[in-house]
């Protein structure tokens, strides 16, 4: 049915879906606080620009009776139920902020006539790529995949002189929502990562992973996994690891590695950690009592979604353009706006760009050190530490296949 948008005559409303099934188990109160903080800033920015308009948010809660798994498994139906609620109320804002689960976003995008923009904190999966009116404010799987292929191919750095073409991927099904979709993208046989690699096998059992660590007949020295150091320790423990094994630990939304007082445990010496540059938002572990770094990133994406809407609203109002048009709905991409922690860049498809950081453990200091950075916007790697104090022989990353070239 035709739903009227509360989006004109100087009054602009944001519909915020508060879903019980969410990419991260974040109290909805924290998300409300983030949205309200964003609204306060947007109102100030619009006022400073001489635009005397009203901007509000409507929080739409699902009843939570049926869809109460708390994670993303039953989010598809919850998302559609919330859309039905909007339809029944005949009331929609200028923009929809909320669905964070890949399942719900994908289905909602399919099942709605999208003449309005949808902003997501999450929706990490490849199935949410290239959606014309969807903006994603947390790094999607495609960005990770492009980094990995870029890094695998790199062979002209002092610490990486071999191109890699093989990998194991550890994926046991207990991953968080972000990790699930990151690994899913690497596993998919039709993905860019799979296309570019000559050999890739998914390890699904703890024992498979543990056996590979010392298996002389292994087909690759490289293992990709996703999670934090504790997750790795639970799996690997203090087991011996062959000297040319490289574990790539994807832990994007965790800035604990950058804290001054953090020492890398011994089991991390064979590990390269891929995380996001903390930018302006570096927290001391003692700092954020309510929010872990990951959950801050999630709430921050909601806040930045509000600021993004404010940015677009300001541009359209200053140009005297209508907000309830396909042009507005398709405009939330290929731009940079002032986010809460600093500038935020969106690519041509509305996905957030960021600086990824690859860390290693220094054998000298037992600290995490930056090996290289990668700018997702230009798909380019920038070496930082040209003579890293690696655990690997000759302070170089080994070849990905044992016995192929000098080790």
């Amino acid at each position: 049915s035709q739903v009227s948008q509360n989006c004109h005559n100087g009054s602009y409303e944001i519909s915020v879906l508060m879903m019980g099934n969410s990419a991260f188990a974040e109290p909805l109160k924290n998300l409300e606080d983030a949205v309200n903080e964003g609204l306060e800033i947007v109102r100030g920015r619009l006022q400073n620009a001489g635009l005397n308009v009203t901007v509000n948010a409507t929080f739409m809660y699902s009843d939570g009776l049926i869809h109460n798994s708390g994670d993303c498994r039953s989010s598809t139906c919850e998302g559609l139920d919330l859309l039905r609620k909007i339809s029944n109320a005949q009331r929609m804002g200028c923009v929809l902020i909320g669905p964070s689960c890949t399942y719900s976003t994908f289905q909602m995008y399919l099942d709605t006539e999208l003449s309005y923009p949808m902003i997501s904190a999450g929706s990490f999966g490849l199935s949410c790529d290239y959606k014309e009116t969807l903006t994603r404010l947390m790094s999607p799987a495609r960005k990770l995949m492009y980094f990995l292929v870029n890094f695998w191919k790199t062979n002209d750095l002092p610490f990486k002189t071999y191109s890699w073409s093989t990998s194991y991927v550890y994926k046991n099904g207990t991953e968080t929502e972000d990790c699930f979709w990151y690994l899913n993208a690497l596993e998919a046989s039709v993905s860019y990562f799979s296309h570019e690699l000559g050999f890739k096998v998914v390890l699904r059992q703890d024992k498979e992973f543990q056996d590979i660590l010392m298996d002389h007949n292994r087909k690759s020295n490289v293992i990709i996994m996703c999670g934090g150091p504790e997750f790795l320790y639970k799996l690997k423990g203090d087991r011996a690891v062959a000297e040319d094994i490289v574990i790539i630990l994807v832990d994007l939304f965790n800035d604990q590695y950058f804290e001054d007082n953090v020492t890398a445990p011994d089991y991390m010496k064979n590990v390269l950690v891929l995380t996001l540059s903390p930018g302006n938002s570096l927290l001391n572990s003692s700092f954020s009592r309510n929010l872990s770094p990951t959950k801050r990133d999630f709430a921050l994406a909601y806040l930045n979604g509000i600021l993004l809407f404010g940015h677009m609203l300001k541009i359209f109002l200053e140009n005297g353009e209508n907000i309830t048009t396909p042009k507005f709905a398709h405009a939330f991409r290929n731009l940079t706006f002032e986010g809460y922690d600093g500038p935020v860049t969106l690519d041509d498809w509305g996905d957030v760009d960021s600086t990824m950081v690859l860390l290693y453990t220094s054998v000298d200091t037992k600290k995490y050190k930056v090996l290289l950075t990668y700018d997702t916007h230009v798909n380019k790697t920038y070496p930082v530490d040209m003579s890293p104090t690696f655990t690997w022989k000759n302070s170089k990353l080994p070849n990905d296949i044992t016995g192929r070239g000098p080790q």
Epitope: N30, D33, I41, N280, S288, R289, L291, L303
Partner: nanobody, 115 residues
Framework: EVQLVESGGGLVQPGGSLRLSCAAS????????MTWVRQAPGRGLEWVAK????????YYVDSVKGRFTISRDNAKNSLYLQMNSLRAEDTAVYYC????????WGQGTTVTVSS
């Protein structure tokens, strides 16, 4: 340890001025938005003013616009609130808070506007 310590409150007559300070320690002050929040007797919390990490943006609640000025000195890890033309309705406990998470609060400083 992360700490925020407010000072500068007191008793002032209507029309008078006060300057509140907030000293921050234990975190990288220059990376965070800061907010002054107040709580009047028997009322809920109300944000008063906020300032971006680099001082580049400042916003105020309507009731204090033109009277209050928020500022910061990142070199000194300090936040300030200059309050002019004070009114009885500005009587409250004033807190500084950091980040949108509002995780860290000071103990507050009391401002009483009365003749």
């Amino acid at each position: 340890e992360v700490q925020l310590v407010e000072s500068g409150g007191g008793l002032v007559q209507p029309g008078g001025s006060l300057r509140l300070s907030c000293a921050a320690s234990g975190f990288t002050f220059s990376r965070y938005w800061m907010t002054w929040v107040r709580q009047a007797p028997g009322r809920g919390l109300e944000w008063v003013a906020k300032i971006r990490y680099d001082g580049g943006e400042k916003y105020y609640v309507d009731s204090v616009k033109g009277r209050f000025t928020i500022s910061r000195d990142n070199a000194k890890n300090s936040l300030y609130l200059q309050m002019n033309s004070l009114r009885a309705e500005d009587t409250a406990v004033y807190y500084c808070a950091t980040d949108f998470t509002r995780d860290v609060w000071g103990q507050g400083t009391t401002v009483t506007v009365s003749s």
